[in-house]
């Protein structure tokens, strides 16, 4: 149930109260202010909204609203010297170029400030070469060209499609397979849903539509010169060359109409399977180079961006906690867009200000959260989710002994079909209560809860009855609270049905045709589904700020590690022979599991029979709720990845966006057969499982009766 | 209305250099690839050149290939000819003539819908 | 280069009655995403020229229904259903499937 405990004498003030105050209208008005010009992080427009919405955090009544500033590494396009693709004949001289910009969106033909489409942090360049097309660049179709067709990438540029993993992700793999560049292009197989008009007619991609992006590997790293520690004014700065994840190659991106010019020309090994081909009318061979007529042309490309040291400006709100002050629950999500942001990030940061509005007219009836909730509005999480990051380094002591949870409020929706959620398995219960609880936006669900709906479209995998709720990956502002600092941590927005929609993410994401009009012509023109996602976000705040007990259930924790642990003993297990030749055993693994069941389910007994009353066993029991998460960090990190220390989980190595399980265990048995010293590598899986036991049986003791 | 407006022709010695401008209005000028077409007296038409609405590709006639060059200034609404090394055969009714299809719907070069009213060029001693 | 060949030179009309003019191209005009790049213009005296047809049979806006366009491949015809005065003209045919863009050399068209 809702918690009905406001620290207000008046019982009206109760979770109902702040769910009425929220109104799609104010929603829908928010949003077309935010989206009117670019924000692109580093820039004066951006620091102007942070200064606007810092003066309307404090009319909406929060205590406090401050702007915290860091000086971080940023990538602009040079003004003067665009980048673009060419095709180049045996003289050198260009045949064909890439477009410079994408035709501007009808009524924003004369803003001024859109960016062109580039890949932010791209080096400097020039190379030419022949063409190398190599489907989504992930680690899978490296392994399929260099292993099973023998094709060398080396010295050759790439062409890959976007979609399926991190953009980041592809650029590694290209330079590690040797390749002197990369062009990213969106297929209309990933970014064009049959039977939908492209933009302004619809909300497909159109053929001049460009994916913009970071290319970084930082691996939760933050600011490039400054891992670690926050990019403040007396902060020491590595050198570019010591610079963290910055890519070595080129890289640019380019629409459809601009890679049907390239691709159609392409000669060399026909695509190994249909898996390889998207719905261009292209062959999709994938070279090397042009086809017998064009063979003496080749691909050059020109790539003049710069890394420039800028400042950047978080938002950081207030509202004080009247019991517990110093526990924090925060909500926070991204201002700075790519161009419009009409979906990303504005339709999140939309309803984190009605969230703040709804909360601010309850403080100012007198009501406080028993706990203190921080908003946020962060800067550059496009280039690599510096804002949030930075802020976090900069007050990692206080989030680590203070941070009861963080809610993620980046785009609202990227679709209108159901609720998706991502969030630690502490919060599962909290959803599933909650969404119960509130009524249902979808068509044929009138008069029923989120919760049937979201069950019956986006049902769980493993349990009937329920709905799916998704392991954290990363590519977001949550990264640095879950990832690094243990803090208990969800998301959660409207998506597509991804039964029928097979494209990656939405068509228009990150492109110049992420408007206003877009979300309200074709997405929620309501502002419905909007709605249930202030009311899902806002709900899971509300409850985490003002239940006496934290609304956390350790049970499910116990559930997810049991079938974790057996999944990566089942990808182990693949290899009978060297588990029993190298002693391998997962024993360790699944007693702790076993040790942290039984733990958890007394631990859970005792939170139902404590004396409430007595705030000292209260705190003590919240906080061993709230150091759960804590535990299952190790201060070593993952190899290689010092800033991804959580064990259970962490950003998939081939693919940011994508959460692990044991990420450790996995890292160390992926691709094991390749390697060429197998005892080595088997111990190195040995060594993992040793860590990831100790670390679920040392969570389990601190669910234990303390004395 | 959509209008195009052509100027800039005249008189001029062979040899010699001469610009030819179209100022656009009525319509998204940024949104359109745009062409040159010529006539000379009594003869049929003739394509001299295209510029992609961004500017990012020019392509010429061979007639007219390394002395004519296609530009455009989004922020003014107006597409340019700079014709050098005029010769006699190039005197004719210049016309500027919008993309039938704005860059958001097409990538290929399409025909032209509208035209403006043309320049005449002279060459001649 | 694409060379576009027109029929007849030229046509004397008596007015209500119709009249064909035939196109053929040296190669064909179906581009691989389906679109066939043929146009027609008329060319009224002293005037600029003025798109009637695009991709080979659709009337552009304001071109009155007398006009219609068909054709595939390599062999177009444009027909006036009922000649009016106001027709007359040098009519073009232009293909757009490659650079350069390639004229016909034009029909004139008469009233008797």
């Known amino acids: 149930k809702s918690s009905n405990e406001a620290t207000n004498i008046t019982p009206k003030h109760n979770m109902k109260a702040f769910l009425d105050e929220l109104k799609a209208e104010n929603i829908k008005k928010f949003l077309y202010n935010f989206t009117q010009i670019p924000h692109l992080a580093g820039t004066e427009q951006n620091f102007q909204l942070a200064k606007q919405i810092q003066s309307q955090w404090k009319e909406f009544g929060l205590d406090s609203v401050e702007l915290a500033h860091y000086d971080v590494l940023l990538s602009y396009p040079n003004k003067t010297h665009p980048n673009y693709i060419s095709i180049i004949n045996e003289d050198g001289n260009e045949i064909f170029n890439t477009s410079l910009f994408e035709p501007p969106p009808p009524g924003y033909e004369n803003v001024s400030d859109i960016v062109p489409p580039f890949s932010a942090f791209s080096p400097q360049g020039m190379p030419e070469g022949d063409l190398v097309y190599v489907n989504y660049a992930r680690t899978e179709d490296f392994f399929k060209l260099e292993r099973d067709m023998k094709i060398n990438c080396s010295g050759k540029i790439v062409i890959a499609r976007y979609g399926k993993v991190f953009r980041g992700n592809k650029v590694k793999n290209a330079q590690l397979a040797g390749a002197k560049g990369v062009i990213l292009y969106s297929d209309p197989a990933d970014y064009f849903a049959p039977g939908v008009k492209s933009y302004p007619d619809g909300w497909n991609l159109p053929g001049g539509g460009v994916q913009r992006g970071n290319i970084l590997n930082l691996n939760g790293a933050g600011d490039p010169l400054t891992p670690g520690y926050p990019a403040n004014e007396y902060a020491y700065r590595r050198g570019i060359a010591e610079a963290v994840g910055l890519p070595s190659i080129p890289v640019h991106p380019i629409g459809y109409y601009d890679a049907q010019k390239l691709l159609e020309k392409m000669g060399g090994s026909a695509p190994p399977d249909s898996s390889w081909r998207g719905s261009l009318k292209v062959p999709y061979n994938v070279g090397p180079g042009f086809t017998g007529n064009f063979s003496t042309q080749k691909v050059k490309m020109h790539i003049h961006s710069t890394n420039e040291v800028t400042r950047i400006y978080n938002v950081i709100g207030t509202l004080r906690g009247a019991v517990e002050p110093d526990r924090y629950v925060i909500l926070g999500g991204h201002r700075d867009s790519w161009v419009f942001g009409g979906i990303d990030p504005q339709s999140g940061a939309a309803v984190v200000h009605e969230i703040v509005r709804s909360f601010g007219t309850l403080k100012k009836e007198g009501w406080r959260p028993r706990r203190t909730i921080l908003f946020a509005s962060w800067d550059a999480e496009e280039f690599g989710l510096l804002g949030s990051t930075e802020w976090a380094e900069e007050n990692s002591r206080l989030l680590q002994e203070r941070g009861v949870a963080y809610i993620n409020a980046d785009s609202s929706i990227e679709g209108n079909y159901t609720l998706r959620v991502d969030c630690t398995p502490l919060m599962y219960s909290l959803v599933h209560n909650l969404t119960k609880e509130l009524k249902s936006p979808d068509e044929g669900f009138e008069g029923k809860s989120l919760y049937e709906s979201w069950t019956k479209k986006s049902p769980s995998p493993e349990f009937s009855g329920m709905p799916r709720i998704s392991k954290l990956g990363s590519g977001n502002d949550f990264e640095v609270f879950f990832q690094r600092l243990g803090i208990a941590s969800g998301r959660a927005r409207y998506t597509k049905n991804w039964e029928t929609n097979k494209f990656s993410g939405y068509p228009l994401y990150h492109s110049v045709y992420e408007t206003y009009e877009l979300v309200e012509k074709f997405y929620d023109p309501m502002f419905k589904y909007h709605l249930t996602v202030a009311q899902v976000r806002g709900g899971m705040v509300f409850e985490l700020a003002n239940s006496i007990v934290l609304p956390f259930d350790c049970r499910d924790y116990a559930v997810v590690l049991r079938k974790y642990a057996d999944k990566i003993y089942s990808i182990s297990m693949k290899h009978p022979q060297e588990m029993k030749t190298y002693s391998v055993s997962f024993d360790s693994l699944f007693s702790a599991v076993k040790n942290f069941t039984e733990i958890a389910s007394k631990f859970s007994e005792r939170l139902q029979d404590f004396d409430k009353s007595n705030p000292i066993v209260l705190r003590m029991m919240n906080d061993q709720l709230m150091f759960l998460e804590r535990a299952f960090i190790d201060p070593l990190g993952l190899p290689d990845r010092p800033f991804y220390r959580h064990v259970i989980y962490a950003p998939s190595s081939h693919n940011k966006y994508a959460g692990e399980s044991f990420p450790g265990i996995y890292d160390a048995l992926f691709d094991i057969e390749s390697k060429v010293d197998p005892s080595k590598a088997w111990g190195e899986v040995k060594r993992q499982i040793y860590v990831a036991a100790f670390t679920v049986q040392a969570a389990a003791e601190t669910l234990s009766e303390v004395a | 209305q959509v209008q195009l407006v052509e100027s800039g022709g005249g008189v001029v010695q062979p040899g010699r250099s001469l610009r030819l401008s179209c100022a656009a209005s009525g319509f998204t000028f940024i949104s359109y690839g745009m062409h040159w077409v010529r006539q000379a007296p009594g003869k049929g038409l003739e394509w001299v050149a295209v510029i992609s609405y961004d500017g990012s590709n020019k392509y010429y006639a061979d007639s007219v290939k390394g002395r004519f060059t296609i530009s455009r200034d989004n922020s003014k609404n107006t597409l340019y000819l700079q014709m050098n090394s005029l010769r006699a055969e190039d005197t004719a009714v210049y016309y500027c003539?919008?993309?039938?299809?704005?860059?958001?719907?097409?990538?290929?070069?399409?025909?032209?819908?509208?035209w403006g009213q043309g320049t005449t060029v002279t060459v001649s001693s | 280069d694409i060379v576009m060949t027109q029929t007849p030179l030229s046509l004397s009309v008596t007015p209500g009655q119709p009249a064909s003019i035939s196109c053929k191209s040296s190669?064909?005009?179906?581009?691989?995403?389906?679109?066939?790049?043929l146009y027609w213009y008329l060319q009224k005296p002293g005037q600029p020229p003025q798109l009637l047809i695009y991709e080979v049979s659709n009337r552009f806006s304001g071109v009155p229904d007398r006009f219609s366009g068909s054709g595939s491949g390599t062999d177009f015809t444009l027909k006036i259903s009922r000649v009016e005065a106001e027709d007359v003209g040098l009519y073009y045919c232009m293909q757009s499937i490659q650079l350069p863009l390639t004229f016909g050399g034009g029909t004139k068209v008469e009233i008797k």
């Open positions: 190669q064909s005009l179906l581009h691989s995403d389906g679109k066939t790049f």
């Open positions: 003539a919008r993309v039938l299809v704005g860059a958001l719907y097409y990538y290929n070069y399409y025909g032209m819908d509208v």
